[in-house]
């Protein structure tokens, strides 16, 4: 996890002191680098990256996605709604990152690093969102049954699921990074 202390952040009067903007930015870029490495192995190992049959696998997934109503795009931007969406989305991605843990051979450590770094990023963001509305945490039982279901898929679907998780997580983080730079 990359370091990055920054004590210069000052909250507006109704906010507690914030965690470091620099740490959040660096953390996201570090995770994105990790995803790139994992995508490289996935694409080298199978032809999933060129496949046109993604819709078949997407039916089994409910991956977090940014929408206009989430307030994270330039059009309709709402910083508080957006920050809640980013944290909620990352919490929802955790089960999918757990699924990735045994899906890689040469990049096993990289998969673990992405998972652990995401946990740290969530902590940073929760500090930034200290006084925002309560953030919904996914139900552990639902996550456990989803994980079992994903792991029971056939090989082709598991490969496609891996590819889709990495692609969706990358897109989610890129949107988050752009939005967080304004905050």
């Amino acid at each position: 996890v990359p370091p990055g202390e920054d004590s210069k952040d000052v909250a507006a009067p109704h906010r507690q002191p914030l965690t470091s903007s620099e740490r959040i930015d660096k953390q996201i870029r570090y995770i994105l680098d990790g995803i790139s490495a994992l995508r490289k192995e996935t694409c080298n190992k199978s032809n999933m990256c060129e496949s046109s049959k993604e819709a078949l696998a997407e039916n089994n997934l409910n991956l977090p996605k940014m929408a206009e109503k989430d307030g994270c795009f330039q059009s309709g931007f709402n910083e508080e709604t957006c920050l809640v969406k980013i944290i909620t989305g990352l919490l929802e991605f955790e089960v999918y990152l757990e699924y990735l843990q045994n899906r890689f051979e040469s990049s096993e450590e990289q998969a673990r690093a992405v998972q652990m770094s995401t946990k740290v990023l969530i902590q940073f963001l929760q500090k930034k969102a200290k006084n925002l509305d309560a953030i919904t945490t996914p139900d552990p039982t639902t996550n456990a049954s989803l994980l079992t279901k994903l792991q029971a898929q056939n090989q082709w679907l598991q490969d496609m699921t891996t590819h889709l998780i990495l692609r969706s997580f990358k897109e989610f983080l890129q949107s988050s990074l752009r939005a967080l730079r304004q905050m």
Epitope: D6, K8, A12, R15, R23, K26, Q74, E79, R178, Q182
Partner: antibody, heavy 119, light 106 residues
Framework: EVQLVESGGGLVQPGGSLRLSCAAS????????MQWVRQAPGKGLEWVAK????????YYSDTVTGRFTFSLDTSKSTAYLQMNSLRAEDTAVYYC????????????WGQGTLVTVSS | DIQLTQSPSSLSASVGDRVTITCSAS?????MYWYQQKPGKAPKLLIY???NLASGVPSRFSGSGSGTDFTLTISSLQPEDFATYYC?????????FGQGTKVEIK
């Protein structure tokens, strides 16, 4: 035309207060973080402060923390810098700038307003 | 705070010359920007995130570098390019600027 226009500068005595305004036009104000940068006469640029688009988060340089307050009135597409306990070293041209969406760059700047702190 | 040192502080050049300005940071920085400022005017963004050309900026301007060492290059100096150039970094708050490089007519 996309533009920022600062106003409110002038001559003030040490210890005095001043409020600068930055009126935005030609673009949708609401998604952009805004910033203030100053330039003392004949000197280089110095970053002063940033405010997030909805005003939830503000950031200040050490030299102005506790004395300056950055605020927004989104209904008027205007940013304000309230400057208290002014010192001679605060004398400068104050520029308002827009932060480029999705980046940390400051892409649109106002023409500046001169603040002179002197007795 | 991160210190930025530009070199040279000033330079004299002729129209058509290739001009290089360097910016050295006291520690590694996350993002580097370059601005042009003319007397009595506001700064104008030229380069963002090390090497991206800002909207409307001529392609004769380019930026490069990473870590602590960065360069602004003007491939063929034009009459309107005589100005002061500043590097600026963001690696958390505060943003900091270099002291400026004045490009004058030889």
């Amino acid at each position: 035309e996309v533009q920022l226009v600062e106003s409110g500068g002038g001559l003030v005595q040490p210890g005095g207060s001043l409020r600068l305004s930055c009126a935005a036009s030609g673009f949708t104000f609401s998604p952009f973080a805004m910033q203030w940068v100053r330039q003392a006469p004949g000197k280089g640029l110095e970053w002063v402060a940033k405010i997030s688009p909805g005003g939830s988060w503000t950031y200040y340089s050490d030299t102005v923390t506790g004395r300056f307050t950055f605020s927004l009135d989104t209904s008027k597409s205007t940013a304000y810098l309230q400057m208290n306990s002014l010192r001679a070293e605060d004398t400068a041209v104050y520029y308002c700038a827009r932060q480029l969406w999705g980046y940390y760059a400051l892409d649109i700047w106002g023409q500046g307003t001169l603040v002179t702190v002197s007795s | 705070d991160i210190q930025l040192t530009q070199s040279p502080s000033s330079l004299s050049a002729s129209v058509g010359d290739r001009v290089t300005i360097t910016c050295s940071a006291s520690i590694s920085v996350s993002y580097m920007y370059w601005y042009q400022q003319k007397p009595g005017k506001a700064p104008k963004l030229l380069i963002y995130d090390m090497s991206n050309l800002a909207s409307g900026v001529p392609s004769r301007f380019s930026g490069s570098g990473s870590g602590t060492d960065f360069t602004l290059t003007i491939s063929s100096l034009q009459p309107e390019d005589f100005a002061t150039y500043y590097c600026m970094q963001w690696s958390g708050y505060p943003y900091t600027f270099g002291q400026g490089t004045k490009v004058e007519i030889k």
